[in-house]
């Protein structure tokens, strides 16, 4: 259900957590790549 139709507050919380975790992983990967390239 990646379209995020659900409005249940627990589902909303889990979606927020998932996005946070994903962004942290992506940003962390980019940071590591930048350090490596230096």
């Amino acid at each position: 259900h990646s379209d995020g139709i659900f409005t249940d507050s627990y589902s909303r919380y889990r979606k927020q957590m998932a996005v946070k975790k994903y962004l942290a992983a992506v940003l962390g990967k980019r940071y590591k790549q930048r350090v490596k390239n230096k």
């Epitope: 259900h1 659900f6 249940d8 627990y10 589902s11 889990r14 957590m17 998932a18 975790k21 994903y22």
Partner: antibody, heavy 120, light 110 residues
Framework: SVEESGGRLVTPGTPLTLTCTVS????????MSWVRQAPGKGLEYIGI??????TWYASWVKGRFTISKTSSTTVDLKMTSLTTEDTATYFC?????????????????WGQGTLVTVSS | ALVMTQTPSSVSAAVGGTVTINCLAS??????LAWYQQKPGQPPKLLIY???TLASGVSSRFKGSGSGTQFTLTISGVECADAATYYC????????????FGGGTEVVVK
């Protein structure tokens, strides 16, 4: 692992607190849930506590039960106004991780359960 | 309210046969469904999540299918060890809901 404790025989109206003790993972990383099962019956969801200590409950709970974290490794289920209908095995279960394309919740790791008997 | 209805409540199967269990959601839950196996005196064990993904260590004889409101658990090549009660569970909502679990299906192996 997940282990429940505190189940015993109580009389109607007596409050009771069950404890779920986890090991091998952190409560700061996983949401936890309580589920119960009356003798010979199906599974019944009670509620969930997340890593931020926010809680969600089944509609039937109506404030009688409260889930809280009491330490970095324990989750309590406080039960009040108990009736014979609350006689059940109470399970503590770890909730699945959330992912961007799958943020549904599932019960991935269960304890053996603790039996609560409410009888006069 | 979102209600999960499981059928049949009990089913009998011969060793080597196939068992089909159905789960109906009262509203669209996309693929947010899990299946659990519970043997007497034991806690439930997660078999399948995201409607069709096998949990770690689960035999490929178990197959989950469906999406939206209709879901199926199929057990092929039934073994004596498959005798248990099976539950479906919607994973779409947990706030002020009735029960995310279906009523259960008892599988008896002959």
């Amino acid at each position: 692992s997940v282990e429940e404790s505190g189940g015993r025989l109580v009389t109607p109206g007596t409050p009771l607190t069950l404890t779920c003790t986890v090991s091998g993972f952190s409560l700061s990383s996983y949401d936890m849930s309580w589920v119960r099962q009356a003798p010979g019956k199906g599974l019944e969801y009670i509620g969930i506590i997340n890593t931020n200590d926010d809680t969600w409950y089944a509609s039937w709970v109506k404030g009688r039960f409260t889930i809280s974290k009491t330490s970095s490794t324990t989750v309590d289920l406080k039960m009040t106004s108990l009736t014979t209908e609350d006689t059940a095995t109470y399970f503590c279960a770890r909730i699945s991780d959330a992912y961007v394309f799958d943020y549904a919740y599932y019960f991935t790791l269960w304890g053996q359960g603790t039996l609560v008997t409410v009888s006069s | 309210a979102l209600v999960m209805t499981q059928t049949p409540s009990s089913v009998s199967a011969a060793v080597g046969g196939t068992v089909t269990i159905n789960c109906l959601a009262s509203q669209n839950i996309y693929n947010s469904l899990a299946w659990y196996q519970q043997k007497p005196g034991q806690p439930p064990k997660l078999l399948i999540y995201r409607a069709s993904t096998l949990a770690s260590g689960v035999s490929s004889r178990f197959k989950g299918s469906g999406s939206g409101t209709q879901f199926t658990l199929t057990i092929s090549g039934v073994e004596c060890a498959d005798a248990a009660t099976y539950y479906c569970q919607q994973g779409a909502g947990a706030d002020n809901i009735g029960n995310p679990f279906g009523g259960g299906t008892e599988v008896v192996v002959k």
